[in-house]
Amino acid sequence: IIPVEEENPDFWNRQAAEALGAAKKLQPAQTAAKNLIIFLGDGMGVSTVTAARILKGQKKDKLGPETFLAMDRFPYVALSKTYSVDKHVPDSGATATAYLCGVKGNFQTIGLSAAARFNQCNTTRGNEVISVMNRAKKAGKSVGVVTTTRVQHASPAGAYAHTVNRNWYSDADVPASARQEGCQDIATQLISNMDIDVILGGGRKYMFPMGTPDPEYPDDYSQGGTRLDGKNLVQEWLAKHQGARYVWNRTELLQASLDPSVTHLMGLFEPGDMKYEIHRDSTLDPSLMEMTEAALLLLSRNPRGFFLFVEGGRIDHGHHESRAYRALTETIMFDDAIERAGQLTSEEDTLSLVTADHSHVFSFGGYPLRGSSIFGLAPGKARDRKAYTVLLYGNGPGYVLKDGARPDVTESESGSPEYRQQSAVPLDGETHAGEDVAVFARGPQAHLVHGVQEQTFIAHVMAFAACLEPYTACDLAPRAGTTD
Amino acid sequence: IIPVEEENPDFWNRQAAEALGAAKKLQPAQTAAKNLIIFLGDGMGVSTVTAARILKGQKKDKLGPETFLAMDRFPYVALSKTYSVDKHVPDSGATATAYLCGVKGNFQTIGLSAAARFNQCNTTRGNEVISVMNRAKKAGKSVGVVTTTRVQHASPAGAYAHTVNRNWYSDADVPASARQEGCQDIATQLISNMDIDVILGGGRKYMFPMGTPDPEYPDDYSQGGTRLDGKNLVQEWLAKHQGARYVWNRTELLQASLDPSVTHLMGLFEPGDMKYEIHRDSTLDPSLMEMTEAALLLLSRNPRGFFLFVEGGRIDHGHHESRAYRALTETIMFDDAIERAGQLTSEEDTLSLVTADHSHVFSFGGYPLRGSSIFGLAPGKARDRKAYTVLLYGNGPGYVLKDGARPDVTESESGSPEYRQQSAVPLDGETHAGEDVAVFARGPQAHLVHGVQEQTFIAHVMAFAACLEPYTACDLAPRAGTTD
């Protein structure tokens, strides 16, 4: 498919001249950021961004790659080096420590320097590092965490927790020896480490005692509370704040977000991770865009500003399953949330960053025709005389041998939301990838986001832009009209 | 391996504070660029950049990812959308048209708008688009093309040629019907379309009549001249310029680059593509770094400045073979050339861009330990109880079934320069990938390189920065001390 207008050199020359004009107009703001938003696409490497752009464009009846994601409109881009101190290819715990606390840690640890060792409780104390969200709170800002995963998952936990094991969601997941040594589960830390104004995502079961039925799935024992200590953490959290509200479904969320008496909001919409966007019950569960909007409504009441973490956390899960359909539709919802946040905030006073914690071994090749489905087949056949998809994985569960051979695939099969793209190496779960990821920036001090940086730089840019520790002497003018 | 100093949060906080300090000091230059250099890593997607960084670092006895490539030091980064008008995943011809001429074209065409159709000679005329190199020449600058491929290959040809088929290297490759219609082979266009001051790379055989023995392989008929028209294009080129010199080996190149009487230099060091850096005979063939240095010595004599295209063209070839060792060692030599050019030029007057034309379906995963070989094995075994490498391809010739199963691999095998990493789909040649690639920029107007852009933007930034057509009214101050 060749669009007629694109055959004319004028089309490209005009477009580039406009882009140049926009580039020339870019003026680095010398003001401080009142608000900070970090959008974290978990596992959203550059190949995921491009494939999602094409898919989002095609959903709007365009050919695809010529369209813009919301994040594409951010004026500044850097590359972020994602390795952890101990691994070339990191996990979401060590990376969360980097972009939220400004310090690199070890694989599967959270909120701890690399002096801490995975799973060794006694290496926790003294090695805690403090997140930018925590520092924002200390500076009088309101703070929030929004995710499509459990709110106790590795990425959001980087904003508030310190743990040598990212899997210690509730005390039931913590070995008795570690509990005796004083190591706390992540859910406990969620409500006790700091005062978080807005908490939205999944993860109900980690907050309630074993045997507590889940409100949405009351007959499913596996979905009920998991805690061994008998604590109802939601109740404890509600008791801390007069204006606190707990919600567990979309209707309650929308009501609470518009209620001026609500000062603190916890919404936990699933026992574990939230459902994939394509599986979401839109009556019961809010979308990431809706959660983001709700969070912004509450947080933006604070005249001192806010810090908000928004995670598209299940992009990563789709990739681990080698189901690109899931990963890419999650990325589109993540981008929709970015777009909505842009409408609800001003780049005059809000520094917004979009990035990924790491990438995936996910590729998009095979010379497909422009406008062809991103989930489709490459032109021609492979060496084994069978069709193959343009999307593939280096490793993962999409490896199937039928009669000692690679299975053939049709366009209809590959377009299915359940289809697992093939991989070179058979694994139960496809792995992360170690290449640099993009950082997109907009707003005050966004111009500092440049070049190739360590992932830790992200936290430092946020802290500096908002004059938080250790950059309180930031020497940035407050935005005209900022109230305190 | 956990470096002790990295266990201390101060290590990361200090490092990030320094990076912030550097970011704050960045001042967009308001001057024009006297010189333009575009470094093109053919097939150098972000995964290739990261893997090469680790390899280069490890060759210097470091752990790897914490080190810097020369391109990493460039202060500005953008992402470039590489699709061609007709394909989601492009080739090196259509992309060369984009980044060198500023207009997108169709797959496998060069220097033509998308109104031209692949292989249809009669769609050439009237659809030619003019490269920035050509415009630089018209503005009185010296110009050069340096590549490790044939100088008639798709990427360098984008600087001077217009052809509906990138494979028309010499007239022997052009169908008789197309020749009768007036379509010229790329080698002919190299010497006749415009005056190029420096031409360095491979591609001897396309310049000489059939039956002309090659000077390096005189007894090898397959390496000799291929031309059917009986023309000696080197002789024709030499006759055009009094100070022209032709060289075919490293010794002659080094002599010619230091000879003030040489105004034009053509060096063709292999009959076809130059040898991979790991196979190069260092007595006979210059490295990419040496060719770059030679080009800069000649071009920098012009007080009006120069345009130079430098291509690490065989990164792409290594990937097509699914031989990451070759691709990554080519990338390192490419980076060495960037480093050397940086030493020989000033960012006060030289805009340097580094980018790729497209990526490859190449991934780096599997959670390897920090400091482990980039060519090594992932920890643990796959689901088939066999080892697997951290580097893998989505498709390509590394797919082998032994007895109906994926072959096992040892660290020693995977570290071999000949080893082909495994792929999900068996192809004769691994394919390009369609995700965005990075653009690194340094020098006057480098700050314009920002955000997510069409690949065409690159040509326009160069033209604008040097006040070339269509931006002669660029309104940029010449650099203090610029001579004309």
Epitope: - | D281, S282, T283, Y325, K402, E418
Partner: antibody, heavy 123, light 106 residues
Framework: EVQLVESGGGLVQPGRSLRLSCTAS????????MSWVRQAPGKGLEWLAL??????????EYTASVKGRFTISRDNSKNSLYLQMNSLKTEDTAVYYC??????????????WGQGTLVTVSS | DTQMTQSPSSLSASVGDRVTITCKAS??????IAWFQYKTGKAPKLFIH???TLQPGVPSRFSGSGSGRDYTLTISSLQPEDIATYYC????????FGQGTKLEIK
Amino acid sequence: EVQLVESGGGLVQPGRSLRLSCTASGFTFTDYYMSWVRQAPGKGLEWLALIRNKATGYTTEYTASVKGRFTISRDNSKNSLYLQMNSLKTEDTAVYYCARASFYYDGKVLAYWGQGTLVTVSS
Amino acid sequence: DTQMTQSPSSLSASVGDRVTITCKASQDINKYIAWFQYKTGKAPKLFIHYTSTLQPGVPSRFSGSGSGRDYTLTISSLQPEDIATYYCLQYDNLYTFGQGTKLEIK
């Protein structure tokens, strides 16, 4: 002109050791992969060992039948290639050739060969 | 490791005959196959590399073809001086020779 000259062959008892040498001239020795190949009486050609070039760190590879017994090495200052053969067996009796690779079409074909040196393992 | 199966092991033909020798690899060798001529008391001589490229000085009656796992050496018109043993060599991944084909005149 590329020249390869093997030496060091001769009669040796089983279980003993022998070192073969190959002197190279006419090319930049450090830039090329070098191999040893043998041909036993009445048998076919058998590739034994490879040592790569400077650019690839002079890494080595062996065929399974000689791994652990034979060692390939090079002295670049002398333009010399060596094959150290330990624990020799009667089946190691063969003409041993030194060969240089050429990188045609990015392959590493064994393009240049010496004339060979005979090794006889017998008690 | 890649195995090479060469056939036939010996072959008797008349002068002027078309002669074909085949080599089958245990896996795809991506056209990285060479053919050598070996005459007793001499070093093996490279005749063809990368499947079909003739070495300098090799008569044009020799040709090579193939792809994937299957490769062929053809002598279009056998000459007396062609009497020798021919070996294929894969060099895609390290090196493996075929068992050889002894060519004789009838």
